[in-house]
């Protein structure tokens, strides 16, 4: 028998490699039996993760499951970095792993560390 | 029934390139992350990589980087590595394992095969 | 890299005897999640490896309660209770919290 807590389904130590000035979406996967959660982004800086207001989010809704997306439109230089969701479920909070932008700025790409430096020198991340 | 397969030939040229195959069933490689582990004859393992398929972001042994290329094809269910410039040394037995990338839920490791590199 | 030690290298056991496998990072496997990426492999002779436990104490589905797995930060332990004649194998620590994972050199659990 399926949990019918809520699950957020990003998975641990994922990345993607996008490109400044370009549009991208960053999907949340959420899996819930009955109510929709209230579903937040945010950006870690350090150890803290700072909520992201006034940013553009919507739904999409699937059979199974739902997506609540961040919007990126435009990609810019300083959205590189991790972000995390995070759901609201019967007053617990449910958060998901953390995923990586490396967000690659096409007009000084060649001056960049590609991103398997980036991965050699994870401090850059925090 | 969950399987993963392992295949390719099992003698390979010295500075030829090794090429394997897993084929996945029974679960959805995208849910999870395909890693290529090896096993020298009577040694320990050695971790090469590992894939995500959703998205084709793959991570490498610093060991392998500069020879190994680990991709995945969501379509078929499969993951595939190839190791350049081969050497005695790459004998090995070779392993994929599919982790489940959310709550670690499963870890399957396919049966294995033997590769020789010799002339 | 980080080194997994694991000791001892071998080990010989009769069954019904309780045994404990310890494996040690150079650094801390603590994620930023908070939780440690340890996991225990089994492997039998001409067999591929086989996941035990994960996050260093969750069994796999399957695998008889006799098998515990406890530690935290870098020091990590891999207790049978009660040794079985099929628990005779090899056991892997593997890291996979940061990257290269790497796996210890193995602990050779023989009959005695």
């Known amino acids: 028998k399926e949990s019918c807590d809520v699950q957020l389904y990003i998975k641990r130590q994922s990345e993607h490699s996008i490109l400044a000035g370009d549009p991208f979406e960053l999907e949340c996967p959420v899996k819930y039996c009955a109510n929709r959660p209230h579903v937040t982004w945010c950006k870690l800086n350090g150890t803290t993760c700072v909520k992201l207001e006034d940013r553009q989010t919507s739904w999409k809704e699937e059979k199974n499951i739902s997506f609540f997306i961040l919007h990126f439109e435009p990609v810019l230089p300083n959205d590189n970095g991790s972000y995390r969701c995070s759901a609201n479920f019967q007053s617990n909070l449910i958060e998901s792993h953390s995923t990586t932008l490396y967000v690659t700025d096409v007009k000084s790409a060649s001056e960049r560390p590609s991103k398997d430096e980036m991965a050699s020198r994870p401090w850059l991340l925090y | 029934q969950v399987q993963l397969q392992e295949s390719g030939p099992g003698l390979v040229k010295p500075s030829g390139t090794l090429s394997l195959t897993c084929a996945v069933s029974?679960?959805?490689?995208?849910?999870?992350?395909i890693h290529w582990v090896r096993q020298p004859p009577g040694k320990g393992l050695e971790w090469i990589g590992r894939?995500?398929?959703?998205?084709?972001?793959?991570k490498y042994n610093p060991s392998f980087k500069s020879r190994a290329t680990i991709s995945a094809d969501k379509s078929k269910n499969q993951a595939s590595l190839k190791l350049s410039s081969v050497t005695a040394a790459d004998t090995a037995v070779y392993y994929c394992?599919?982790?489940?990338?959310?709550?670690?839920?499963?870890?399957?490791w396919g049966q294995g095969t033997l590769v020789t590199v010799s002339s | 890299d980080i080194q997994m030690t694991q000791s001892p290298s071998s080990l010989s056991a009769s069954v019904g005897d309780r045994v404990t496998i310890t494996c040690r990072s150079s650094?801390?496997?603590?994620?930023?999640?908070?939780?440690?990426?340890l996991n225990w492999l089994q492997q039998k002779p001409g067999k591929a490896p086989k996941r035990l436990i994960y996050?260093?104490?969750k069994l796999d589905s399957g695998v008889p309660s006799r098998f515990s797995g406890s530690g935290s930060g870098t020091d990590f332990t891999l207790t049978i209770s009660s040794l079985q004649p099929e628990d005779f194998a090899t056991y892997y620590c593997?890291?996979?919290?940061?990257?290269?994972?790497?796996f210890g050199q193995g602990t050779k659990l023989e009959i005695k």
């Open positions: 394992a599919s982790y489940e990338g959310y709550y670690e839920r499963f870890g399957y």
């Open positions: 029974g679960f959805n490689i995208k849910d999870t992350y």
């Open positions: 894939n995500d398929p959703a998205n084709g972001n793959t």
């Open positions: 650094q801390s496997l603590l994620d930023r999640d908070g939780k440690s990426y």
């Open positions: 996050l260093v104490s």
């Open positions: 593997w890291q996979d919290t940061h990257f290269p994972y790497t």
